[in-house]
Interface confidence: low
């Protein structure tokens, strides 16, 4: 056969869907790969072709686009289930092509089985909502495409295992859920179970997202340098070992970048020729607040390292701080001979 | 084979409420959703709302919100359309339609209810 | 709402003729790839009658001289060859939105 652009194996696009559920998944070749959309393909007069590979088998084989009840069936660039089986996991190819052109990419979907109370392998979406904020939604996830909006679905709401109904302050409304004010104990997995009826069948689409309550830009403030401060002074003789922790606390700021650094003298330690190592932790508050730490360690310090200027750095997206840490060189105390002979003038 | 089979003629005054059924065979009732749809004397025609026989919700046009009341019996199969504080404007042809998925199409018909208001 | 606008509003095609009807929609009814667009015949008397869905999909028993096509706004209904029994009043609808609307028809005579 003639020569295909094989993308190989988008493991990037590792497709979960739950068992005996529909399922529309698009030709990824589109979407990440070509220039092109597929009508434009398809106005060029190139063909769509699936097929697939069964878990734990080599073997590639074409769809069978002939089940009873159109189970699974192409329309443009999307592959239908309706619905999916356990077996229905596997590697799927979509092939674009003509008598001179040809393109392909493979995708891992798998379809996986949920319990009665929604638990399963599946890898789940993380919403954070904001502390004591006022009214936040969420929305049921990827139902799109699967009826039009003339169709009014029944969508039932679950937090864990129970359904959401008189809950003091989360409400259902259709396919948002709402959150009056979000408290630490709203933290959990939301389930929407979405169900319409499609030739002369009834549908469920199930999703489930992790909620997680998150500190509020009201309360944001920028980092604060818990260490060094004014309070402690670094003192060693040369040859102990220098360890100078800076210790930064973040407020939780959606989508900001926080970052600590040393600088000796002003540069980098990087750019430094002194035998210097940082060493990172971090942790977070239950709202994910974050304390970064970084211990700046000199294993034998010199003199001349005792006199240099070491400074901690942080930056978020509210500002950026610096605080000096105070290092000085221990004096050695006095022996008592030597003050008692200078004491006396003795020669 | 699927029908729908609407209930006879309706003369009615100005001002009273009229209750058209629709029964459905040849299929599973619950498993559709029903449209009604009106038509004028030699007009187009008129979407009025639908109903899920299943849990009994409806979707109405605004036009039609205060006018039109959706209803269905699941044990005979039968929706039903109430229509109140009648005018000579609600002269006219309801049809009962069966809407398909995934085209949302309307692929059955009903015989059509004509109802003439008239002192 | 959506509006959708048929032309023309009659028209007369003499027998084995082509028969073009139009139908713009206000706002694209395309809805993932599928457009939402239908095709329907009135006959006098009677109850409309599905010939074609998702704009090119002919229901089942409608005859092969039916065909539908177009995409986003714009869609066309054409009859070739036109029969005796053609004669009717054809409609548009589209079902991408609530609420459902309906062209103003299209009255085809046969010469």
């Known amino acids: 056969s003639e020569r295909c652009d094989d993308w190989g194996l988008d493991t990037m696009r590792q497709i979960q869907v739950f068992e005996d559920e529909p399922a529309r998944i698009k030709c990824p070749l589109f979407e990440h790969f070509l220039k092109f959309n597929y009508s434009t393909a398809h106005s060029a007069g190139l063909t769509l072709i699936w097929y697939w590979t069964r878990q734990d088998r080599d073997l590639e084989e074409p769809i069978n686009f002939r089940l009873p009840e159109n189970r699974i069936s192409k329309e443009k660039d999307v592959l239908w289930f309706r619905p999916t089986l356990l077996n229905d996991t596997g590697n799927y190819t979509c092939m674009l092509r003509n008598t001179t052109y040809c393109s392909k990419v493979a995708f891992p979907l798998e379809v996986v089985q949920k319990d009665s109370c929604f638990n399963s392998p599946m890898k789940l979406p993380v919403h954070k909502l904001y502390i004591e904020y006022g009214i936040q939604r969420i929305t049921c996830p990827n139902v799109d495409g699967y009826f039009p909006s003339s169709v009014k679905p029944t969508i039932t709401w679950y937090m864990g295992c129970y359904k959401i109904q008189n809950f003091n302050n989360v409400i259902p409304e259709g396919m948002n859920l709402s959150f009056l004010i979000a408290l630490i104990s709203n933290n959990g997995n939301y389930t929407c179970v979405v169900t319409y009826p499609e030739n002369g069948r009834t549908f469920h689409l199930t999703r489930t997202l992790t909620v997680k309550v998150v500190g509020s830009p009201k309360n944001a403030v920028p980092p604060v340098i818990h260490s060094p401060n004014d309070h402690v002074v670094y003192e060693k003789e040369p040859g102990e070992e220098l360890l100078i922790p800076c210790t930064v606390y973040f407020s939780f700021l959606m989508d900001s970048r926080n970052e600590v650094w040393w600088t000796i003298d002003g540069k980098k330690p990087d750019d430094i020729t002194i035998d210097v190592t940082i060493n990172e932790s971090i942790s977070h508050s239950r709202t994910e607040d974050e304390t970064r730490t970084q211990i700046l360690s000199i294993k034998k310090v010199t003199s001349e390292d005792l006199k240099r200027s070491y400074v901690c750095h942080a930056r978020s997206a509210k500002g950026e701080v610096a605080k000096a840490a105070k290092v000085k060189q221990k004096v050695p105390a006095p022996r008592y001979t030597v003050e008692l002979a200078c004491g006396f003038g003795a020669t | 084979e699927v029908q729908l089979q609407q209930s006879g003629p309706e003369l009615v005054k100005p001002g009273a409420s009229v209750k058209i059924s629709c029964k459905a065979s040849?299929?599973?009732?619950?498993?559709?959703?029903m449209n009604w749809v009106k038509q004028s004397h030699g007009k187009s025609l008129e979407w009025i709302g639908h109903i899920n026989p299943n849990s009994g919700s409806t979707t109405y046009t605004e036009k039609f919100k205060d006018k039109a009341t959706l209803t269905v019996d699941k044990s005979s199969s039968t929706a039903y359309m109430e229509l109140r504080s009648l005018t000579s404007d609600d002269s006219a042809v309801y049809y009962c339609?069966?809407?398909?998925?995934?085209?949302?199409?309307?692929?059955?018909w009903g015989t059509g209810t004509t109802v003439t208001v008239s002192s | 709402d959506i509006v959708l606008t048929q032309s023309p509003a009659s028209l007369a095609v003499s027998l084995g003729q082509r028969a073009t009807i139009s139908c713009r929609a206000s706002e694209s009814v395309n809805f993932h790839g599928t457009h939402l667009m239908h095709w329907y015949q009135q006959k006098p008397g009677q109850a409309p009658k599905l010939l074609i869905y998702?704009?090119?999909n002919l229901d089942s028993g409608v005859p092969a001289r039916f065909s539908g096509s177009g995409s986003e706004t714009d869609f066309t209904l054409n009859i070739h060859p036109v029969e005796e029994e053609d004669a009717a009043t054809y409609f548009c609808q589209q079902s991408i939105e609530d609420p459902f609307t309906f062209g103003s028809g299209t009255y085809l005579e046969i010469k």
């Open positions: 998702a704009a090119s």
């Open positions: 339609v069966r809407r398909i998925g995934k085209n949302w199409h309307c692929d059955v």
């Open positions: 040849g299929y599973t009732f619950t498993d559709y959703y």
